[in-house]
Interface confidence: medium
């Protein structure tokens, strides 16, 4: 259903409008394949506003309908290696509560060093987002070439 | 912080909602790296609503967060041609006020004729956007292939 | 020109907010290259606030611009296939009315087996968006890898 | 147009070995899997093997697996089965068919030779 | 190995009328990528087989859209909506899904 009260004057606060852009820290120990992500004007240009950091992985603050982005670049790479080492792949996904475990977003790179994507779908407060990265090549952790990040869309 | 004034009626200009959306004018001369862009109804479905364009490049009016997004197709391209003039990259970024440059989103060809990226970052009034193409392959100007754009998302 | 009415109140409701975000559900017959959605909560994270689904086809039913995005996956696909199979061509673009009917978004898939992309369009109430995939590979069905969707974005 | 020619079949006696050729022309070979299916005399369709389009990857029907060698030499057009340690439950039309091209051995046979005829037999 | 089963073995008709057969894998031939990896070939008496259905529901180039295929995980079925004599000869299933690659036995369509 549409909107129960749409004449209802609507308070700055419910916008919602909760929003992260994350840049790369590192990348996890063998065997964890999660990226560890780190936000805040202190380190450039990414920032928190309603999500939060929780060891690196996103957590979600407001029940919605979120754009989920996100930019991988490898590090060391051409497309020959790219292909040769192929599949290396990201996937996107809420990694916790395990309840709603579930890949939201995957992406191989092929013969391509670089993968970027984008899309909707409804998040709630306590989601967790995990972004795994699977293969033997490393990501870039240039501000301008990797980069995750949310943005609340609707209730 | 989050919203000082929360329970604040909200204003429809309050919202922002600056967008724009431009198609490919014409690359630079020699030594120019930068795509020059162009938009208005009268092209076509591109469009500015609040930034401006000053000498084929997009002037930010309003202090926010914004979501940037371009794609970038290589007129004249295989998989051959792409990989045989690499690296052919493209690169968003903050040009001018000089204070203020700096990349924001970087994306190389590789073996593909096609990028395409967003990020959510902060744009303050009075940024000029550039985008640059290096390498030796011209991108097509086709307005379903090639095209830039902002939208505002939040203050 | 801006907004008229600067410092009216802002209804919930006006905001529009239409939102909508689709899975696949199968090709076309022969010598249809259009992808046929679906979405709704019984299916998993797909969902229709607003716009609605016609024969499979995406329904616009407000005025606006709008944020089109769309992943597509190649189901069985190796960059060696892909560039073998090449051209396979993903196209976005408004297939009905007649009159308004435009190709918004394009790209090839050369050596790669994902394409994603997303961009700006003004759309008005009653365009309906097809998805043309062109070339002789299938598409993933995966919701992670294959799927489509809008955002109202500003009037 | 696509074709697809077998060769080499014959008549020969169990434990002996034979090489089959399948010459391929109207497409780009060497972008393309291939395989081996054969037919018994009166019974139906078997699959014996298929190579990817570089040779990079075989794979083998159990009934063959350390006896038959599926080969391609891209630079010629040609495919190849060495059958080696022949039995009479080898007796076939033997038909080389174009992978679908999908990728390397996940589609369809969508073209196929006119077979060659193997008899194993004393 | 995975092991395909096809009913019935022979099946008479008559043209202009509808005809289907039944294929039957030992476990699912549903690829994680959406698809069922199940194809169907013809062979027509005295010729090498043709390509008729792959994945399941797709007709390969220049097969007629009288031919049908449906189906998911471990059911199919092959489907002429109206039979004509050039359709006689055996109708073969395979599992495309993972090597060895497997027939089923064949059904033969013969007209009335």
């Known amino acids: 259903q549409r909107f129960a009260q749409a004449q209802q004057q609507l308070p700055l606060e419910s916008l919602g409008w909760d929003v992260a852009e994350l840049q790369l820290n590192h990348t996890g120990p063998q065997q964890d394949p999660r990226l560890y992500w780190q936000g805040g004007p202190a380190l450039g240009r990414s920032f928190l506003h309603g999500p939060e950091l929780d060891k690196g992985q996103l957590r979600i603050h407001r029940d919605g309908i979120y754009m989920v982005h996100i930019q991988v670049t490898l590090a060391i790479c051409s497309s020959t290696t790219a292909s040769r080492h192929h599949p290396t792949t990201l996937a996107v996904g809420i990694c916790s509560p395990a309840s709603r475990s579930i890949s939201l977003l995957r992406l191989s790179f092929h013969q391509g060093c670089t993968i970027a994507s984008q899309r909707l779908t409804p998040l709630a407060r306590g989601d967790t987002l995990c972004t795994n990265l699977t293969g033997t090549l490393l990501p870039s952790r240039n501000t301008d070439e990797t980069f995750f990040g949310v943005q609340w869309v609707r209730p | 912080q989050r919203f000082a004034q929360a329970q604040q009626q909200l204003p429809l200009e309050s919202l922002g909602w600056d967008v724009a959306e431009l198609q490919l004018n014409h690359t630079g001369p020699q030594q120019d790296p930068r795509l020059y862009w162009q938009g208005g109804p009268a092209l076509g479905r591109s469009f500015l609503h609040g930034p401006e364009l000053d000498k084929g490049q997009l002037r930010i009016h309003r202090d926010g967060i914004y979501m940037v997004h371009i794609q970038v197709t290589l007129a004249i391209c295989s998989s051959t041609t792409a990989s045989r003039h690499h690296p052919t990259t493209l690169a968003v970024g903050i040009c001018s006020p000089a204070s203020r440059s700096i990349s924001l989103l970087r994306l190389s060809f590789h073996q593909g004729c096609t990028i395409a990226s967003q990020r959510l970052t902060p744009l303050a009034r009075g940024d000029t956007l550039c985008t640059n193409l290096t390498g030796t392959l011209l991108p097509s100007r086709n307005t379903d292939e090639t095209f830039f754009g902002v939208q505002w998302v939040r203050p | 020109q801006r907004f008229a009415q600067a410092q009216q109140q802002l209804p919930l409701e006006s905001l529009g907010w239409d939102v909508a975000e689709l899975q696949l559900n199968h090709t076309g017959p022969q010598q249809d290259p259009r992808l046929y959605w679906q979405g709704g909560p019984a299916l998993g994270r797909s969902f229709l606030h607003g716009p609605e689904l016609d024969k499979g086809q995406l329904r616009i039913h407000r005025d606006g611009i709008y944020m089109v995005h769309i992943q597509v996956t190649l189901a069985i696909c190796s960059s060696t296939t892909a560039s073998r199979h090449h051209p396979t061509t993903l196209a976005v673009g408004i297939c009905s009315p007649a009159s308004r009917s435009i190709s918004l978004l394009r790209l090839s898939f050369h050596q790669g087996c994902t394409i994603a992309s997303q961009r700006l369009t003004p759309l008005a109430r009653g365009d309906t968006l097809c998805t043309n995939l062109t070339g002789t590979l299938l598409p993933s069905r995966n919701t992670d890898e294959t799927f489509f969707g809008v955002q109202w974005v500003r009037p | 147009q696509v074709q697809l020619v077998e060769s080499g079949g014959g008549v020969v006696q169990p434990g002996r070995s034979l090489r089959l050729s399948c010459a391929a022309s109207g497409f780009t070979f060497s972008s393309y899997g291939m395989h081996w299916v054969r037919q018994a005399p009166g019974k139906g369709l078997e699959w014996v093997a298929v190579i990817w389009y570089d040779g990079s990857n075989k794979y083998y029907a159990d009934s063959v697996k350390g006896r038959f060698t599926i080969s391609r030499d891209n630079s010629k057009n040609t495919l190849y089965l060495q059958m080696n340690s022949l039995r009479a439950e080898d007796t076939a039309v033997y038909y080389c068919?174009?992978?679908?091209?999908?990728?390397?051995?996940?589609?369809?046979?969508?073209?196929w030779g006119q077979g060659t005829l193997v008899t194993v037999s004393s | 190995d995975i092991v395909m089963t096809q009913s019935p073995l022979s099946l008479p008709v008559t043209p202009g009328e509808p005809a289907s057969i039944s294929c039957r894998s030992s476990q699912s031939l549903l690829n994680s990528n959406g698809y069922n990896y199940l194809d169907w070939y013809l062979q027509k008496p005295g010729q090498s087989p043709q390509f008729l259905i792959y994945l399941g529901s797709y007709r390969a180039s220049g097969v007629p859209d009288r031919f049908s295929g449906s189906g998911s995980g471990t059911d199919f079925t092959l489907r002429i909506s109206r039979v004509e004599a050039e359709d006689v000869g055996v109708y073969y299933c395979i599992n495309s899904l993972q090597t060895p690659f497997t027939f089923g036995p064949g059904t033969k369509v013969d007209i009335k």
């Open positions: 068919a174009r992978d679908g091209g999908y990728s390397g051995y996940d589609s369809g046979f969508d073209y």
